[in-house]
Amino acid sequence: ESRAELTSDKDMYLDNSSIEEASGVYPIDDDDYASASGSGADEDVESPELTTSRPLPKILLTSAAPKVETTTLNIQNKIPAQTKSPEETDKEKVHLSDSERKMDPAEEDTNVYTEKHSDSLFKRTE
């Protein structure tokens, strides 16, 4: 089973219900919507930090990206078969210390979610 770590920094639309409802689809880094193409939000929104307790697969733990970083979630649609219950989500929360986060200033105040079934593009191409 592959898992991908996903990120977002400035999600204006995050609320607690969307965290539980949308955990089945990979969340997008909201950095991605403040781009040169003119899309996206600019404000930072504080939200609790959490990460799943399951380890990432070896393919994801590269020397260039060994650290756990965080993400907020903005998913309007969900895939029922992939969605976890609030109970399952709660079981997977882990609170990290500041030293463990090692986050960039631009990437603070965010959550981390990992995608249970999302194989990388390279793996899908094999």
């Epitope: 996903l6 689809v25 950095d31 970083e69 990388s120």
Partner: antibody
């Protein structure tokens, strides 16, 4: 704010080489896969290449395979596209784009640069 | 390679009216994890493309809810419930299932 700025484009003769750069800011560059996509004048989008966050994995579009090489310097927050044996049909605006998933290349392109124009002509 | 085919090529729409764009792939984009690796992008005049929809039906952050994506396998649809003037541009579908990533030819949405 995420920013991607391409540079290095210009007029080049067929058969010659050119190196494009993409400088980024506003996110942890070393955590994201990066792509190059091009658009010939008045035409649609064509994917060119992808490189994983750690530079261990690379893939190319059929039309550039063997001629173009994608690299990155994570210490300088810069993505490169080395183009050799250039052809007139390589004339296009070249965009760099950031993958949307950290530490894992999803294939979805969340942030795009403004593009740099490469013209291959004698 | 996966071939992506979009229709129509051009789509004149009256503001406030709905619009629909079709995208077909030469092979199924439904992966074993249950996700369809199909994205929609909009390139507004003079701008870089921007991501609208990913994994077939999920709106990217900041994208108005009048945009929706649907479909599975080889047939996908982007719908705009009520077109606004700012929606003009060229819409592209793209398969992200495997490399080489491939785009549809584009659909130019214009205001009547």
């Amino acid at each position: 704010e995420v920013q991607l700025v391409e540079s290095g484009g210009g007029l080049v003769q067929p058969g010659r080489s050119l190196r494009l750069s993409c400088g980024v800011s506003g996110f942890t560059f070393s955590s994201f896969g990066m792509h190059w996509v091009r658009q010939a004048p008045g035409k649609g989008l064509e994917w060119v290449a992808v490189i994983s966050n750690d530079a261990l994995h690379k893939n190319y579009g059929d039309s550039v395979k063997g001629r173009f090489t994608v690299t990155r310097d994570n210490s300088r927050n810069t993505l490169f596209l080395q183009m050799t044996s250039l052809r007139p049909e390589d004339t296009a605006v070249y965009y760099c784009a950031k993958d949307v998933v950290r530490g894992h290349t999803s294939g979805s392109l969340g942030s795009w640069g403004q593009g740099t124009l490469v013209t291959v002509s004698s | 390679d996966v071939v992506m085919t979009q229709s129509p090529l051009s789509l004149p729409v009256t503001p406030g009216e709905p619009a629909s764009i079709s995208c077909r792939s030469s092979q199924s984009l439904l992966y074993s994890n249950g996700y369809n690796y199909l994205d929609w992008y909009l390139q507004k005049p003079g701008q870089s493309p921007q991501l609208l929809i990913y994994l077939g039906s999920n709106r990217a952050s900041g994208v108005p809810d009048r945009f929706s994506g649907s479909g599975s396998g080889t047939d996908f649809t982007l719908k705009i419930s009520r077109v606004e003037a700012e929606d003009v541009g060229v819409y592209y579908c793209m398969q992200a299932l495997q490399t080489p990533l491939t785009f549809g030819g584009g659909t130019k949405l214009e205001i009547k």
